[in-house]
Interface confidence: low
């Protein structure tokens, strides 16, 4: 549903967007996922703050936890035990890292309505969560794990060597928060909450990068963080496990780590429990190209885990690294030994394999020149998963249901004809033995949540339509977009072009290339969205496009892999083939192209802005990498290798953005990071400056002091400003 | 209950062409990757072609690579297969069936029965 | 291509007799084997799949065992209604291939 376009006399009612509406928000969307907690019933919390359960089946809902006690310790969030006789409210919410953040907790008895005094939790705390059935609590405080039988128990501490900067328990360290985990917690409990597994990572012999953050004191601070970049020492990583019923009879035991792993240096990636007596864990080599899954099995008489070698899983990837950015994890089936994971065919295509004994002998699921994205859910009868199989467009998302419990083990599409303008990229989320579904729909259309049965499919209610959203865009003259590819030498470029609402295909525009390009990533996607870039089509008349090219995901392995062990080279090519083709349609105004990005995009931008085209007249390049031997050693060395002479040293090196200084010569370059960002360092835009100036070549800067990687707050405000100025000074466009 | 149905067949002489359709009914044909398979009289099973769901992915036995094109139609529940430059070899009665995803072909329409000769 | 090798190629046995054929394949198919029952003049029907899993409404005297590159296919009482030529075929991987079957005649 994108509002529809009034033409002739009411046009004249109608505006263009403004950079404010963009700064203000005024045009973002809501979506509603449920907190699930049972089969048929959620959590979810109200307009006016209340925690209110729903049951479906009976159509009623309660409040299980006023406003008023949530406003009471300043709570921004909460967590009901399974047992449903406690809720933990989270308070004092302190950002660290991208997911990682420390907060206060109070545990409220839903029984008496008054918070549990005595034996309270310690402050900050980096973690905390139920166990999945019952009130049993887990939680990270100073680097090391506690465990509380009930809320006002005392509490049990099951490690003791945590050490900030040193020694991470129950909580990853930097790098694999960001690069591997993704999450802020490394501990996982067993399905009944009879034993606890948990991660240490060792950072005792990582380097560390240090950098000032100013802040209003005389003195600036110095961070610290261990951060193993390309080819350094990384962390040491150990998975134990302990039995919370018994915490003190044997404690945590060692988990063994696979043979053909331990022999050289390697990762954990994950752990998945399958019931409370057999554990799956994932190790990685350092060279990323080779992944175990082991299936390991407690022994009673011995009180340790078994791994035997018979329950090890090896996927490798011969032509690229394993998996897409992450390896999948696997979702196991009723029978506790056999699953279903996403990995490589034959073909090339990452697709839905199950996998009974071995992986030789994997039975495939899905198939097709298409790609499975995620499996969501496995019951007795159904897998439902997310693919972007249907009418072949790579940047949309539909949720299907295979049968697996009967023959003819059929599939359906639940989404793709469910509202096909408005809605054709979706994620969804299921209740308890998927008897409910809601399905979130991201456009490209204005998004729409709504709730589903888990047997029939059929629409129960809408949950959030965005009418308030819609409502607003009635009289906006949004951009018109259009996504499409190109076939350049046996290679498709999906690409989505965002134009001027009159656009005239008679008439020349200026173009604006916006490129993220890193490895697995995917730009062209059929959501909705109200943003910078909608803004400078709709007010200042250019056209924007965004292109998908080699190294990108979900379109086949040979895309993907392309990139591998020379990152900077095809993603470059790519985007100034599609400006070619794009000057070719014969409405981009040829003396008027510009390139942006941020992150991997602006290392991007900034290797097409030196690539000595003569295509760019000017770009942007926010907190680019400028050489990937400052970048993280997870990230970097899964798609380049090692720095070495012996491995791909001189890829390293050719790959920089300091190489090309020279190339910058005859473009207009704005240079923009924040100077307290953890994850591409300020370092990659200093070394750039370095270079630009030692071969005196004039450039724009602008840094942003003691912001991170996402430039957020008033930063925000301020950058997009003056990326807006310089734009328009650029394509003559007066301001 | 699921039905196909193929038409189509008959005489043709060698280096001539043919198109065989299959009607479809029963099931939800846009949700399902079909397939051709050949029958020489008196011989076994050939498979010949397979096209996916959404028509966008084909595949072929490499005796008819280059000469047939499997093709199909959602909205007519109905598949095809364009027989170009015939030979005597392709004298056959083609069955049309239905796939599931990645497993066997579990239902078969009657056949046509395809004649090459000069 | 993977060869899909059926044998034996025909075979007489008596009502009430157990009866055996085994399909062996050049390659490791896993378990991506189906078994198809054609009758004179009629279309083949699909009896197992996944090596081992009947079809709907398929009797349970049909049975089918192996995986990776042996499979077996099993009529555990001979009926005069199974006279019919059986095929093996593999969807492991294209091309889809299939055994050269195996005629069933009642003695």
């Known amino acids: 549903l994108r509002p529809s376009r009034v033409h002739n006399s009411e046009e004249n009612t109608m505006r263009a967007l403004t950079l404010k509406d963009i700064l203000n928000g005024t045009f973002s969307y809501k979506t509603f996922f449920p907190n699930w907690i049972s089969g048929q019933e959620y959590l979810h919390q109200s307009a006016d703050n209340n925690i209110v359960l729903y049951n479906i089946e009976t159509g009623q809902s309660y409040t299980i936890l006023s406003n008023r006690t949530m406003k009471s310790v300043n709570a921004s969030n909460y967590g009901l035990s399974p047992d449903r006789q406690f809720v933990y409210l989270e308070s004092d919410y302190s950002k660290l890292w991208r997911y990682s953040y420390t907060a206060t907790y109070y545990i409220y008895d839903l029984s008496n309505g008054e918070f549990v005094r005595g034996n309270e939790l310690p402050r900050p705390i980096q973690y905390l969560c139920w166990s999945p059935v019952g009130s049993k609590l887990a939680y990270v405080y100073q680097n090391n794990i506690y465990l509380k039988q009930r809320p006002g128990d005392p509490p049990f501490q099951i490690t003791f060597n945590g050490r900030e900067n040193k020694i991470f328990n129950g909580i990853p360290d930097w790098v694999y928060e960001e690069e591997m985990l993704a999450t802020k917690y490394a501990l996982w409990w067993s399905p009944n909450g009879k034993f606890l597994a948990y991660a240490e990572f060792n950072d005792t012999d990582i380097p560390v990068i240090a950098y000032s953050y100013y802040g209003d004191e005389q003195y600036p601070r110095t961070i610290n963080i261990p951060y193993p970049k390309a080819g350094a020492k990384n962390p040491v990583v150990r998975i134990f496990i302990i039995d919370t019923t018994y915490p003190a009879y044997v404690g945590p035991q060692e988990v063994p780590v696979p043979a053909m792993i331990a022999s050289s240096d390697y990762y954990f990636s994950w752990l998945t429990w399958v019931t409370d007596e057999r554990v799956c864990l994932q190790w990685l080599k350092r060279v990323q190209n080779v992944s175990v899954l082991s299936i390991c099995d407690f022994r009673e008489d011995w009180q340790t885990w078994d791994c035997p070698k018979t329950q090890e899983h090896i996927e490798e990837s011969r032509t690229g690294w394993a998996g897409g950015f992450f390896v999948s994890t696997p979702v196991f089936s009723y029978d506790a030994i056999s699953y279903y994971k996403i990995f490589s065919d034959k073909d090339g295509y990452k697709h839905i394999h199950y996998i009974k004994d071995t992986v030789e002998n994997a039975i495939q699921i899905t198939s097709g020149k298409w790609e499975a994205i995620n499996i969501f859910r496995v019951t007795q009868d159904s897998l439902f998963y997310s693919s972007n199989e249907f009418e072949e467009y790579p940047g949309r998302r539909n949720i299907y249901r295979i049968s697996i419990g009967s023959y003819p083990p059929s599939k359906k599409c639940v989404t793709c004809h469910l509202r096909k303008e408005r809605c054709q990229y979706y994620t969804a989320s299921f209740s308890d033995y998927a008897k409910y579904y809601a399905l979130v729909c991201y456009g490209p259309g204005i998004p729409i949540s709504t709730l589903h049965d888990g047997r029939t499919d059929q629409e129960i209610k809408i949950l959030e339509e965005n009418k308030e959203l819609e409502n607003a865009l009635k009289n906006i003259q949004l951009p018109k977009e259009e996504i499409k590819k190109l076939e350049v030498d046996e290679i498709t470029l999906w690409y989505k072009m965002i134009l001027p609402p009159q656009f005239d295909r008679s008439k020349k525009y200026p173009l604006l290339i916006q490129v993220y390009g890193g490895p697995c990533s995917q730009s062209v996607r059929s959501v909705f969205a109200v943003n910078w870039i909608s803004y400078l089509a709709s007010k200042e008349g250019m056209v924007i496009a965004l292109v998908d090219g080699r190294g990108t995901a979900f379109q086949g392995d040979k895309l993907l892999y392309a990139v591998y062990r020379k990152l900077g080279v095809y993603e470059v090519e790519d985007q100034i083939t599609a400006v070619r083709k794009f000057i070719e349609m014969g409405f981009i105004d040829e003396k008027r192209i510009a390139i942006w990005g941020w992150s991997y995009g602006g290392y991007v931008s900034s290797l097409a802005l030196a690539s000595g085209t003569g295509l760019f007249k000017c770009g942007i390049a926010v907190a680019p990498v400028s050489s990937w031997e400052y970048y993280a050693s997870v990230y970097t060395e899964r798609f380049m290798g090692l720095p070495t002479k012996d491995d791909n040293l001189e890829h390293y090196k050719n790959s920089t953005v300091m190489a090309r200084a020279e190339y910058f010569r005859n473009v207009d370059y704005l240079l923009i990071h924040g100077t307290a960002d953890d994850n591409v360092h300020f370092q990659n835009s200093a070394q750039i400056a370095k270079a630009l100036v030692n071969a005196q070549v004039d450039f724009q800067a602008m840094w942003y002091s003691d912001q991170n990687h996402g430039l957020s707050g008033l930063s925000t405000n301020h950058l997009y400003t003056h990326m807006t100025h310089f734009l328009k000074q650029c394509f003559s466009l007066s301001d | 209950d699921v039905q196909l149905v193929e038409s189509g067949g008959g005489l043709v002489k060698p280096g001539g062409s043919l198109r065989l359709s299959c009607t479809v009914s029963?099931?939800?044909?846009?949700?399902?990757?079909m397939s051709w398979v050949r029958q020489a009289p008196g011989k076994g099973l050939e498979w010949v072609s397979t096209?996916?769901?959404?028509?966008?992915?084909?595949y072929y036995a490499d005796s008819v690579k280059g000469r047939f094109t499997i093709s199909r139609d959602n909205a007519k529940n109905s598949l095809y297969l364009q027989m170009n430059s015939l030979r005597a070899e392709d004298t056959a009665v083609y069955y049309c069936?239905?796939?599931?995803?990645?497993?066997?072909?579990?239902?078969w329409g009657q056949g046509t029965l395809v004649t090459v000769s000069s | 291509d993977i060869q899909m090798t059926q044998s034996p190629s025909s075979l007489s046995a008596s009502v009430g007799d157990r009866v055996t054929i085994t399909c062996k394949a050049s390659?490791?198919?896993?378990?991506?084997v189906a078994w198809y029952q054609q009758k004179p003049g009629k279309a083949p029907k699909l009896l197992i799949y996944?090596?081992?899993t009947r079809h709907t409404g398929v009797p349970s005297r049909f049975s089918g065992s192996g995986s990776g590159t042996d499979f077996t296919f099993t009529i555990s009482s001979l009926q005069p209604e199974d006279i019919a030529t059986y095929y093996c075929?593999?969807?492991?991987?294209?091309?889809?291939?299939f055994g050269q079957g195996t005629k069933l005649e009642i003695k």
């Open positions: 996944w090596a081992s």
């Open positions: 390659q490791d198919v896993g378990i991506a």
């Open positions: 029963g099931f939800t044909f846009s949700s399902y990757t």
């Open positions: 096209i996916s769901s959404g028509g966008s992915y084909t």
């Open positions: 075929q593999q969807y492991s991987r294209y091309p889809y291939t």
């Open positions: 069936t239905r796939d599931q995803v990645g497993y066997a072909m579990d239902y």
